[in-house]
């Protein structure tokens, strides 16, 4: 049915399928060193890995995409691993009047799925 | 900054970057012919194409991902083209008591971005 449960066991082997992974990045890596003051180093959770058939399908569209990719791989791409939710982060950054705090709620991934 | 505007012109040439494309699919293609009655053929809009640096970035996370992919391509994947919104679709399907209409909110893509 259109609401089949997404598959959660990876058929490709451990760590190969869509999952959350921590990537260390400095403000210089991000090109933010001129306006963000702190933290100097960010632990950025990102979504990496493959999306085999019906693995962690985000929704009905992703299930259809997986199916049609099997039928028409040149025309329809496989689903890919993207954030399903985010963790807010507070950054200290420069302002005209000094330093202020600002939250970013779309910066660090909290969970991943195949869309 | 973290809120740079997403780039909208495709540097790879016409039709190569992330966009919406219509894919024809029958109920048989989708494996739905045993429970969906109508429509027999669906025009499924799907997101296809590449996501070059900062093209149609979904959010701050996607911008970071694009940047880190440039620095660490083996560790951080490029953003990929996924739906940003959906168009509701009404399907007529079999039930125990006969036939009913049901709306699916997450079946057909309406817009795309790079996440």
């Amino acid at each position: 049915s259109a609401h089949a449960h997404p598959r959660d066991s990876c058929p490709l082997g451990p760590g190969r399928c869509c999952h959350l992974e921590t990537v260390q990045a400095t403000l210089e890596d991000l090109g933010w060193s001129d306006w963000v003051l702190s933290p100097r180093q960010l632990q950025l959770s990102m979504c990496v890995g493959e999306c085999p058939h019906l693995y962690r399908s985000a929704n009905t569209h992703a299930q259809i995409k997986a199916r049609l990719h099997g039928l028409q791989p040149d025309k329809v791409p496989a689903p890919c691993c993207v954030p399903s939710s985010y963790t807010p982060v507070v950054l200290m950054h420069r302002t005209d009047s000094g330093v202020s705090l600002q939250t970013y709620d779309d910066l660090v991934a909290r969970g991943c799925h195949c869309a | 900054s973290a809120h740079a505007h997403p780039r909208d012109s495709c540097p790879l040439g016409p039709g190569r970057c992330c966009h919406l494309e219509t894919v024809q699919a029958t109920l048989e293609d989708l494996g739905w012919s045993d429970w969906v009655l109508s429509p027999r053929q669906l025009q499924l809009s799907m997101c296809v194409g590449e996501c070059p640096h900062l093209y149609r970035s979904a959010n701050t996370h996607a911008q970071i991902k694009a940047r880190l992919h440039g620095l660490q391509p083996d560790k951080v994947p490029a953003p990929c083209c996924v739906p940003s919104s959906y168009t509701p679709v009404v399907l007529m399907h079999r039930t125990d008591s006969g036939v009913s209409l049901q709306t699916y909110d997450d079946l057909v893509a309406r817009g795309c971005h790079c996440a």
């Epitope: 003051l37 950054l91 705090l101 | -």
Partner: antibody
Amino acid sequence: EVQLVQSGAEVKKPGESLKISCKGSGYSFTSYWIGWVRQMPGKGLEWMGVIDPSGSYTIYSPSFQGQVTISADKSISTAYLQWSSLKASDTAMYYCARYGRYGTYFDYWGQGTLVTVSS
Amino acid sequence: QSVLTQPPSVSGAPGQRVTISCSGSSSNIGVLYVNWYQQLPGTAPKLLIYSNDNRPSGVPDRFSGSKSGTSASLAITGLQAEDEADYYCQSWDSSSNYVFGGGTKLTVLG
């Protein structure tokens, strides 16, 4: 084991100055922000401000701006909260707290320093 | 007056389930996570729940958090005498940064 150890209780007179401390151990002191929180007798928690010990950047709650100074000495993994001229209304328990990884919550707290200001 | 509103007190008998609410607005709870702290009598606050519904290691699973819209709640099941404490919610507010609720005193009856 992460620990924040604060200096002992203080009894002061109005108009006097004071500097209390918070020493971090069991983690990389410069990798986490330190915040200060006030709790007046019988009352709730109030956020006063935050410092990034690595660069000594400070941000204050509007309610405490100009009333206190937050500083840090990263060479001895210690953060400070100071007053140049105490008032009776500064009588309270003061806590230092370490910020969690993404800066949205306080994951470890000091035991508190009780400051009593009375003539 | 706290930016986040909590009931001043709640009570329950041992073994019961109690909930503590925390009401905010679209400029705080509505946009960011809620965290909960437990302050046992005469001690420093301790992180109980972070990011709406996550427990730090060592916190019993009798404690759980949830958030809906501009409100959050802390639930404690199988109430025990040692749960008697003050409980504070905390979030972020765009105007005053880190904000706490006024605190709720939990009394375990009997």
